[in-house]
Amino acid sequence: MMTGTIETTGNISAKKGGSVILQCHLSSTMAQVTQVNWEQHDHSLLAIRNAELGWHIYPAFKDRVAPGPGLGLTLQSLTMNDTGEYFCTYHTYPDGTYRGRIFLEVLESSVAEHSARFQIP
């Protein structure tokens, strides 16, 4: 039985050219996290964090994605095309798979402030 919940940074906004931290947190379960996958709105993988083997950043994102903090992901040099949904998928044992959603809006305005809040989707 899957008892856990994924908390995410929810809907966030950040400036074009800036950076943003994508964070998910799995709570309310004792399940072991074996792998975390980070995906973009077009279903392409940005990164995988395997519990035993470490981080794999996909080649297309190598220059703009930094692993961490923790199981999160830092997306750098933001462009308007980065606006959209991001998904964290937690593979766990024995529970199975948990999935969280974050919506990132990249703003042109130089006065746009990065906003983030933890929420349960």
């Epitope: 996958n37 279903h43 993988l45 995988i48 395997n50 035993e52 996909y58």
Partner: antibody, heavy 119, light 107 residues
Framework: DVQLQESGPGLVKPSQSLSLTCTVT?????????WNWIRQFPGNKLEWMGY???????SYNPSLKSRISITRDTSKNQFFLQLNSVTTEDTATYYC????????????WGQGTAVTVSS | DIVMTQSHKFMSTSVGDRVSITCKAS??????VAWYQQKPGQSPKLLIY???YRYTGVPDRFTGSGSGTDFTFTISSVQAEDLAVYYC?????????FGGGTKLEIK
């Protein structure tokens, strides 16, 4: 260049244990990556069995978890497969392979060793 | 388990032809797919990783594409030495699984 070479008995009796060795040259198994066992059944089906990582942690295919053990000897740069309580269904060609984190795929494979389970 | 299905066990082609081999995942695997080539009497060899990326030294006639559940491996101009079995493999989760293989036969 990285090379992997499997060795072990080609014939094992049912209910006994299958033990294979993979000798790695050209790369230290404690440096990085995951060191895997994969088998190929007659008819070509491939099955990932498990790995031992550079740090010594292991990950196994759940379908084999109760029967499989992967260990290593770092001084000889070797890792080992032990599969207990074998049946004729375990007849296959067994490969060792390196799983590279930068490609997230198996980039180097051994030549394979055929194992028949028969009385 | 994620099942990777290669619907064609055999494909027949001629030298110089373009051929595409398909692989379907039983559930979403994003772009976490690799393709391997196994020539007769040899071990598998990595050709494509993470869906579209060509491994070091692999000729550019080999390409991979797809995301989600549907993946395609293409040889733009088949050579005689491409006679082999081709496998897809997913690493979306920690139980890595392979497709059943597609044997490419040269007419």
């Amino acid at each position: 260049d990285v090379q992997l070479q499997e060795s072990g008995p080609g014939l094992v009796k049912p209910s006994q244990s299958l033990s294979l060795t993979c000798t790695v040259t050209g790369y230290s198994i404690t440096s990085d990556y995951a060191w895997n066992w994969i088998r190929q059944f007659p008819g070509n089906k491939l099955e990932w069995m498990g790995y031992i990582s550079y740090s010594g942690s292991t990950s196994y295919n759940p379908s084999l978890k109760s029967r499989i053990s992967i260990t290593r000897d770092t001084s000889k740069n070797q890792f080992f497969l032990q599969l207990n309580s074998v049946t004729t269904e375990d007849t296959a060609t067994y490969y060792c392979a390196r799983f590279m984190i930068t490609t997230f795929a198996m980039d180097y494979w051994g030549q394979g060793t055929a194992v028949t389970v028969s009385s | 388990d994620i099942v990777m299905t290669q619907s064609h066990k055999f494909m027949s082609t001629s030298v110089g032809d373009r051929v595409s081999i398909t692989c379907k995942a039983s559930q979403h695997v994003s772009t976490a797919v690799a393709w391997y080539q196994q020539k007769p009497g040899q071990s598998p060899k990595l050709l494509i990783y993470s869906a579209p990326y060509r491994y070091t030294g692999v000729p550019d006639r080999f390409t991979g594409s797809g995301s989600g559940t549907d993946f395609t491996f293409t040889i733009s101009s088949v050579q005689a030495e491409d006679l082999a079995v081709y496998y897809c493999q997913q690493h979306y989760n920690t139980l890595w699984t392979f497709g059943g293989g597609t044997k490419l036969e040269i007419k």
